[in-house]
Interface confidence: low
């Protein structure tokens, strides 16, 4: 059976914490990704941004987990209306921003 959304979000947060804490060299070799609007559709938007990073084992599990929250199929190069136009940030910063936002959602009980 699927895990409850609260558990899934908790697992995603734990994975992001793990990434930030275990970061030694620049995450994903300093790859840049599109910054996203965190106020709506965060899971699909985050996946649409991170899926463009390939060959980075550190975020593969995160990519798979985000995939579970997004109902539609996401492929590399897909444009998201939720991205912050023409603004790119390092994956490490993206993960930190996402982590802060998801922790807030979890505290507020917004698991969906």
């Amino acid at each position: 059976s699927p895990v409850p959304p609260s558990t899934a979000l908790k697992e995603l947060i734990e994975e992001l914490v793990n990434i930030t804490q275990n970061q030694k060299a620049p995450l994903c070799n300093g790859s840049m990704v599109w910054s996203i609007n965190l106020t709506a559709g965060v899971y699909c938007a985050a996946l649409e941004s991170l899926i463009n990073v390939s060959g980075c084992s550190a975020i593969e599990k995160t990519q798979r987990m985000l995939n579970g929250f997004c109902p539609h199929k996401v492929s590399a190069g897909q444009f998201s209306s939720l991205r912050v136009r023409d603004t790119k940030i390092e994956v490490a910063q993206f993960v930190k921003d996402l982590l802060v936002h998801l922790k807030k959602l979890f505290r507020e009980g917004q698991f969906n």
Partner: antibody, heavy 123, light 107 residues
Framework: EVQLLESGGGLVQPGGSLRLSCAAS????????MSWVRQAPGKGLEWVSA????????YYADSVKGRFTISRDNSKNTLYLQMNSLRAEDTAVYYC????????????????WGQGTTVTVSS | SYELTQPPSVSVSPGQTASITCSGD??????AYWFQQKPGQSPVLVIY???KRPSGIPERFSGSNSGDTATLTISGTQAMDEADYYC?????????FGTGTKVTVLG
């Protein structure tokens, strides 16, 4: 253990009504979307309707739109399907399904099915 | 309305590979799901998200999806795999099931 138990099926005349119920147990019912899927005798599967989890959205197949209404009572862990203006072609086994629809779920798809309840529409 | 087309039947010898196709317009842009249904039983999800197996589903079941076709492959088919198989996708706020394929294990 996750379980879905359908009830309410039976024999009804064309134009009549029935209300199907699905009692859920073993999971946090309110967190999940639920669907009804039917299967006519000797035929394939046909999705009928879905009710999203926290989102409160409802969805219907064109074949039942305007005649069937899906609802849920999270306090009773129960999903319902109100079927009005029934036709012979609505004769089928109706399955209650724990769903993976939409942005409200950790989306695995329809991985828990009830045993089904039989609806027969005949005069 | 969106349609998913499957071959009515597929026959396979024990131990061989059975492939079931599911065709739909730009199906590769959607997630494909596969269900197994044995006579008198409720359907069972065997593949979700094109190629992922739920826990408890044997490794011999695999899936792929690209272009207009999703494929369910059963490697080393066993007698217990004889069943009806249905593909499924989500399109325009409705679920769509395929027409179904009866897999017969010969012998």
């Amino acid at each position: 253990e996750v379980q879905l138990l359908e009830s309410g099926g039976g024999l009804v005349q064309p134009g009549g009504s029935l209300r199907l119920s699905c009692a859920a147990s073993g999971f946090t019912f309110s967190s999940y979307a639920m669907s009804w899927v039917r299967q006519a005798p000797g035929k394939g599967l046909e999705w009928v309707s879905a009710f999203s989890g926290s989102g409160g959205s409802t969805y219907y197949a064109d074949s039942v739109k305007g005649r069937f209404t899906i609802s849920r009572d999270n306090s009773k862990n129960t999903l319902y399907l109100q079927m009005n203006s029934l036709r012979a072609e609505d004769t089928a086994v109706y399955y209650c399904v724990q769903d993976g629809l939409g942005p409200y779920f950790y989306n695995y798809g329809m991985d828990v099915w009830g045993q089904g309840t039989t609806v027969t529409v005949s005069s | 309305s969106y349609e998913l087309t499957q071959p009515p039947s597929v026959s396979v010898s024990p131990g061989q590979t059975a492939s079931i196709t599911c065709s739909g317009d730009k199906l590769g842009d959607k997630y494909a799901y596969w269900f197994q249904q044995k006579p008198g039983q409720s359907p069972v999800l065997v593949i979700y998200h094109d190629s992922k197996r739920p826990s408890g589903i044997p490794e011999r079941f695999s899936g792929s999806n690209s272009g207009d076709t999703a494929t369910l492959t059963i490697s080393g088919t066993q007698a217990m795999d004889e069943a009806d198989y249905y593909c499924q996708a989500w399109d325009s706020s409705t679920y769509v099931f395929g027409t179904g394929t009866k897999v017969t294990v010969l012998g």
